[in-house]
Structures are given as structure tokens and as C-alpha cells.
């Protein structure tokens, strides 16, 4: 009696059970009763990334220079080619077909994660006691300077885009 | 599919104003929206842009004085906090978002006119 | 800070003849450039994008070209209905702190 089901790895045709092709092979011919399933290697820059009876391979992502996009990881005949942006840019999505131009943190803002080529800067305003007055894409917020520690006494308070502004303590005559 | 901007008139320095941006024919769900100014006989100025995330980001000259907003599917607000002569200008809204231009504006509203004077 | 730069700020042209503007980024932004024409009274309509894929309607008289971090923007054929303004863009500056992503524009006359 012709099977309704095939095990892992097998597939239906013409009422027989039939092996699929590995990754990184195409299906030439289906099996018969006298024949295993024929297959061939993907060709180079292509690939097929699982248990399969297509009959084309697919070809590898490509990396538009155009786009930003440089290969990160280059695809085998088993895996796709992985693309990621040049410095200073991120993907505009998972699949990575775009870039986008990294944020800079405002001047107040200070980087709390520093951009990658998947994600954009993160950041974060500066909290009291600390300050940014550039725009960066890499700067923290610092710090506000003690003066304290200076022997010095504070002339001028800061804000959270400038620093405190030190000054000598008056002497007494 | 159109874009209609809404609120522009004669302002006296330093009243605050609210200009409408409304969508027919589609929803800004999937949209990054932006607002672009033109001052009289002037290039394009871009504003700011609110992402599908309602996450915005402005040009680095806006310093505080613009605030936009989704307000519904189908509608974004351009506040302007204490308008000066300077931001006398004809304000598009535009409809950005494409997945590999993400920045590209293929739809304009068409303008109207905000007149800052005393 | 991506600047763009735009030259010349106005060029005229005869009816039939050819005119090239010129757009160039501060710094590499790839090709991700667009071209507007703006007329009198109008909102920009989009040209160009990906600095040479020609949007839809466009007749082909126009053309876009890049090399390296400068844009060309030539118009053959020149009509009439060509005088305008025409501005380029850099299209991926995403929440970058830009100033603005528009080139300061040139007037194309007609004559």
C-alpha cells in the first residue's frame, strides 16, 4: 500500500517516499523505485539552507557599496552572505538592506549605548551633576568638576549642557 | 492618497501656534512624517521627523522650538513655542519611509503659510 | 554634520539646450541622494532617488548621476515647463543630528 506520510528528511512523490536533498544542494531528479534522489552542489554564490527539493539554488545577499553595506559574514553553500554597514552607519532593518547615518546625542544628552552596525545610538539626558555641551555619537555626560577638591569654590552652577565654573575662595584680610 | 496641512496664519511674536498635517487615502501608522519650512523666496528647511515608533528627531537649529506629534492615524501636529520673525515660512508636511530610502519624500502637502509679525 | 552643497545657485539655459547642477555631500553619504523640482506655489515633486533611479513620470531627458560624495543632476532637451527650482536631498540621515539634508537649491531659467 503507497505511503501517505514520510519520515524526517523524505518527501512525497509519485505515491514513494523520497530523500531531500542536504543543505547546500539542489534536486535534479526525485527518486524512483529503481533510483535514490539525484542532487549537485549549489554553484558559487548560491545557497540552500535547508533539507530541501528545490530545484534552484538561491543566490547570495549582495552587499551594495552603493547602499553602505559591506559583507560581515560571506555565505557558503549552506549559509546566506551577511551584510552590515560601513562605520558611522546602522541597518535600516533585520535583513540589513539599507543603512541608515548613526544619531549624534544632542548637546544635554549624553551616548548611554554606543551605536553598532545593527542599532542606533541610544541616549540619554544628563542627569543633575553631570553634562554634555557637544553633539557626538560617543560621548557619555561628565561629570561636573568639584571644585571642592580644587580648594576651590563654585563661581558659576552648571546645567546639564555646561560645566560648573570654579573660582578662588575669598580670602579674608 | 493626499496630505493637507492646516493653521497657518498671522501670529504676533511669541504666541504659540499648532499646524495639522492630515492624511487621506492612507494611514502614517507605517510612515515616518516630516515637516519641511520654506521662508519667502527661500530653499527648503527640514524641521524634524516622527518615526512609526512616535520617536522624533529634530535639526540640530531647532533647539526646543518645535515639538511634532502623532496625533492619530491619520494626523501629526507641528507645534511652534514662541515664533519669531524668522519662522515666517510656508510649512509642508511630507510623507517619508521607504524601506530602503528611508528618508525620501515622495508625498508634499501643499503648504500653508504661518506669518509671524508685530 | 552632513552638509550639501549646491552649485550653482542659478543657470539659464535655451529651449533645446542642456544644463548641469551640481550637489556635493561634506561627506560620504553613499548614494543616498534625491532630486526635487520646485515650482512657484508648489510643494517639491521627487525626481530622482538612490542618485540615478529616475521616479515614476519622469521623462528621461533628465538624468542623475554620482561620483564619489558629488551629485549631477543633467537636464537635456530643455523645455519650458522646466524653469524651476531644483533642490538635492541626502535621504538617510534617519535621527542623525543634521542641520538640514537639503541642498541650498538652484533656479534653472529657461530662454
Known amino acids: 500500500e503507497p505511503p501517505t506520510a514520510c519520515r524526517e528528511k523524505q518527501y512525497l512523490i509519485n505515491s514513494q517516499c523520497c530523500s531531500l536533498c542536504q543543505p547546500g544542494q539542489k534536486l535534479v531528479s526525485d527518486c524512483t523505485e529503481f533510483t535514490e534522489t539525484e542532487c549537485l552542489p549549489c554553484g558559487e554564490s548560491e545557497f540552500l539552507d535547508t533539507w530541501n527539493r528545490e530545484t534552484h539554488c538561491h543566490q547570495h545577499k549582495y552587499c551594495d557599496p552603493n547602499l553602505g553595506l559591506r559583507v560581515q559574514q560571506k555565505g557558503t553553500s549552506e549559509t546566506d552572505t551577511i551584510c552590515t554597514c560601513e562605520e558611522g552607519w546602522h541597518c535600516t532593518s533585520e535583513a540589513c538592506e539599507s543603512c541608515v547615518l548613526h544619531r549624534s546625542c544632542s548637546p544635554g544628552f549624553g551616548v548611554k549605548q554606543i551605536a553598532t552596525g545593527v542599532s542606533d545610538t541610544i541616549c540619554e539626558p544628563c542627569p543633575v551633576g553631570f553634562f554634555s555641551n557637544v553633539s557626538s555619537a560617543f560621548e557619555k555626560c561628565h561629570p561636573w568638576t568639584s571644585c571642592e577638591t580644587k580648594d576651590l569654590v563654585v563661581q558659576q552652577a552648571g546645567t546639564n549642557k555646561t560645566d560648573v565654573v570654579c573660582g578662588p575662595q575669598d580670602r579674608l584680610r | 492618497q493626499s496630505l493637507e496641512e492646516s493653521g497657518g496664519r498671522l501670529v504676533t511674536p511669541g504666541t504659540p501656534l499648532t499646524l495639522t498635517c492630515t492624511a487621506s487615502g492612507f494611514t502614517m501608522n507605517r510612515y515616518r512624517m516630516s515637516w519641511v519650512r520654506q521662508a519667502p523666496g527661500k530653499g527648503l528647511e527640514w524641521i524634524g521627523t516622527?518615526?512609526?515608533?512616535?520617536?522624533a528627531s529634530y535639526a540640530s537649529w531647532v533647539n526646543g522650538r518645535f515639538t511634532i506629534s502623532k496625533t492619530s492615524s491619520t494626523t501629526v501636529d507641528l507645534k511652534i513655542t514662541g515664533p519669531t520673525t524668522e519662522d515666517t515660512a510656508t510649512y509642508f508636511c511630507a510623507r517619508a519611509g521607504d524601506n530602503i530610502y528611508v528618508d525620501l519624500y515622495n508625498l508634499w502637502g501643499p503648504g500653508t503659510l504661518v506669518t509671524v509679525s508685530s | 554634520d552632513v552638509v550639501m552643497t549646491q552649485t550653482p545657485a542659478s543657470v539659464s539655459g535655451a529651449v533645446g539646450g542642456t544644463v548641469t547642477i551640481k550637489c556635493q555631500a561634506s561627506?560620504?553619504?553613499?548614494?543616498?541622494l534625491a532630486w526635487y523640482q520646485q515650482k512657484p506655489g508648489q510643494p517639491p515633486k521627487l525626481l530622482f532617488y538612490?542618485?540615478?533611479n529616475l521616479a515614476s513620470g519622469v521623462p528621461s531627458r533628465f538624468s542623475g548621476s554620482r561620483s564619489g560624495t558629488e551629485f549631477t543632476l543633467t537636464i537635456s532637451d530643455l523645455e519650458c515647463a522646466d524653469a524651476a527650482t531644483y533642490y538635492c536631498q541626502f535621504t538617510n540621515y534617519g535621527s542623525s543630528d543634521i542641520r538640514s539634508p537639503f541642498g541650498g537649491g538652484t533656479e534653472v531659467v529657461v530662454k
Open positions: 516622527i518615526n512609526n515608533d512616535a520617536g
Open positions: 561627506e560620504n553619504i553613499f548614494s543616498y
Open positions: 538612490g542618485a540615478s
